[in-house]
Each structure stands twice: as structure tokens, then as C-alpha cells.
Amino acid sequence: LQDPCSNCPAGTFCDNNRNQICSPCPPNSFSSAGGQRTCDICRQCKGVFRTRKECSSTSNAECDCTPGFHCLGAGCSMCEQDCKQGQELTKKGCKDCCFGTFNDQKRGICRPWTNCSLDGKSVLVNGTKERDVVCGPASAGFSPGTSSVTPPAPAREPGHSPQ
């Protein structure tokens, strides 16, 4: 025996209260596949979420984050505040990277400048809060096992970032 509900297309549900008639999904609900016995509630894009695609009877709404926030998680399930390059997000807000660290993204955390001297190179371009140092050619007089004559940049060990 074929299940009568299998004939109900997407956008409808099999209504047990009405002799398994295919009824349209009520407002603010959807069914993306046929044969459903209930319709799912549409996702609401509220607060820091904004609507990227409206809900229809056959597909859920899609959200993204309002300007100043970025998506995390499947289907943009979370929004996290952006900062500027050269900053990192703490509970007290966006804080500048400490000296010797940088962040070239609007999200994430600061990380230490590369220590050019570890590879026997010199600093060609100094680092900033937004950019890593650029390492240049090998330091004069460098050979493996000897230290660089260039004053080393801060080692790539994390410093204490501001809270």
C-alpha cells in the first residue's frame, strides 16, 4: 500500500486532521521535501542577523550578519563582531595589537611578527600592527649555527594582549 502522504509535494504537509489531505504550509513555515507530515518553522533573522533570502513555502530563510559582524558556523548560525586590521576582539571590545604582534584580518587575533633572525635573515621591512615584517636576504656573516648580526625582531612567542 502506498502511503498517501508520499504524494504531498514540497510546500505542503500531510494533514492527519483532514484525512491526510495535502495542506499548504501555514505562513512562516516551509517544507523543502515531499511527503512531510509537518512544516518547519521559518528561521527568523533578528538582532545582528539580517535576511539574505526570504522564507518561502519550499525553502527556509537564509541569514547573514549585519555590517560590522562576520558569520561563523553552518548557515551563518553565529555572528561575531568585526574589528579593524591591527586589532583583536576582546570582551571589552576591539583592542590594538600589542607591539611585536599584528593582525591582517578584520577578525581573529594578533600573532607575533616573524623572527627573521631564526632563518638567518634580516628585517627588510618593519612590521606594523596590520602587517608582518618582511624578511630580506641572509644577514652578513651568517652561517648555520651562528647568530644573526641583525637585532632580532620579537620572537614568535605570544605576548600579553590587552584585555
Partner: antibody
Framework: QVQLVQSGAEVKKPGESLKISCKGS????????ISWVRQMPGKGLEWMGK????????NYSPSFQGQVTISADKSISTAYLQWSSLKASDTAMYYC?????????WGQGTLVTVSS | DIELTQPPSVSVAPGQTARISCSGD??????AHWYQQKPGQAPVVVIY???NRPSGIPERFSGSNSGNTATLTISGTQAEDEADYYC???????????FGGGTKLTVL
Amino acid sequence: QVQLVQSGAEVKKPGESLKISCKGSGYSFSTYWISWVRQMPGKGLEWMGKIYPGDSYTNYSPSFQGQVTISADKSISTAYLQWSSLKASDTAMYYCARGYGIFDYWGQGTLVTVSS
Amino acid sequence: DIELTQPPSVSVAPGQTARISCSGDNIGDQYAHWYQQKPGQAPVVVIYQDKNRPSGIPERFSGSNSGNTATLTISGTQAEDEADYYCSTYTFVGFTTVFGGGTKLTVL
């Protein structure tokens, strides 16, 4: 869609070396931190360390510093966790996860069994 | 590094409120996040940044964080909420993430 796919289960003997992998897809792999998390049988989650694949900068939990090595190859969007000499106490499920504070995507886990 | 302490187990009757605590020195100065893990599965975020709920997580999940304690609250607990729950925080001192020991929630 974003996915982290880990290499398969491993059975090893004490003293052997091992390198497990975590391949990211569906996002800019180079610009998101990847963390590794250990879960010993019947126990809780332990954060081991993280890597920024863009420049391979790593940072370890003090408990795991010197015990494991985390690396990445951004050209193939893959992060690695490796041991030079396994111990029986390394038997655990190992997860990779995207992020450094909020872990929004997780791999399926790699079960590592170390037994003589 | 900060240490996060959770009760090993919490039991609750269906429909009642479950509260899971996570204590650590001045955890309120950092963001706390909460993960749910069911047997054989990877963890899933249920609360992030102290009190924010990802879409797809039921409204009965809520969080708070101040002083030395972060709390995950599940109002009207359902059988499907039975799982292990872990708090975590990222500390800028040491640049590390720490997980609590985990709490097994049993729905009676």
C-alpha cells in the same frame, strides 16, 4: 559548504611515529585558525594547540608543548598533528576544529590507539 | 593558565530547569562558550560569547557569565538534551583555550 575531513583511525605500537591530517574545504583555509583537541576514552575535551595556516604560526597548550607538533600545508588546505614517539597514554580521539575561541566547525575525529 | 571547574554530573526531571556551572578565576573577564557533545559525535556550540545562542539551538538554552562563574541554563529540559556539556574560554594571557572538565546531564 565548510568541511573539515580527518584521516582515518590508526593503530600503533609504543615508540612509533604518527602524523594525522585534517583537510579543510569550502572556506579560505589560510585565514582561519585550526585547533587540535584531544579526548581520551571516557574523558573530557583538552585543547592541545592551534596553527594559523597562512604563515604556519603555532601556539601550544603548556600540557602538550614538546609532546606533539602541529603543522599545515596551505597549498593543500591541510593541517597536521604528529608524534615522534607514541605512548600508550596517547590513545584518544583527536579532533581538529576551526577557530581559536569559538570552534564553529569540527572534524569527525581520528581515533588513535597505541598498544603493544 | 585559568582552570575551569564544572560539576561532573547534573540530573534534572523532564520539563524542569537544569543549571550547569563553570567556575574559574575572573572568568567573567573573558568570553565563555558552551559545547554540547552526544555519544560518538563531535561537540556543537550551544552558547557563544557568554549568552548568544546560535540559530538552530532551541530557545530553552541560555547563558550568563560574571565574576568567577559562567552558567548554562536549560529551561524546560527535554530528553534530547541529555549529553555532556563543556564550557571553554580563550585567555589572552598565554594565548590559549581552556575547556572545563565537562558535565554529564541526565534527564530522569
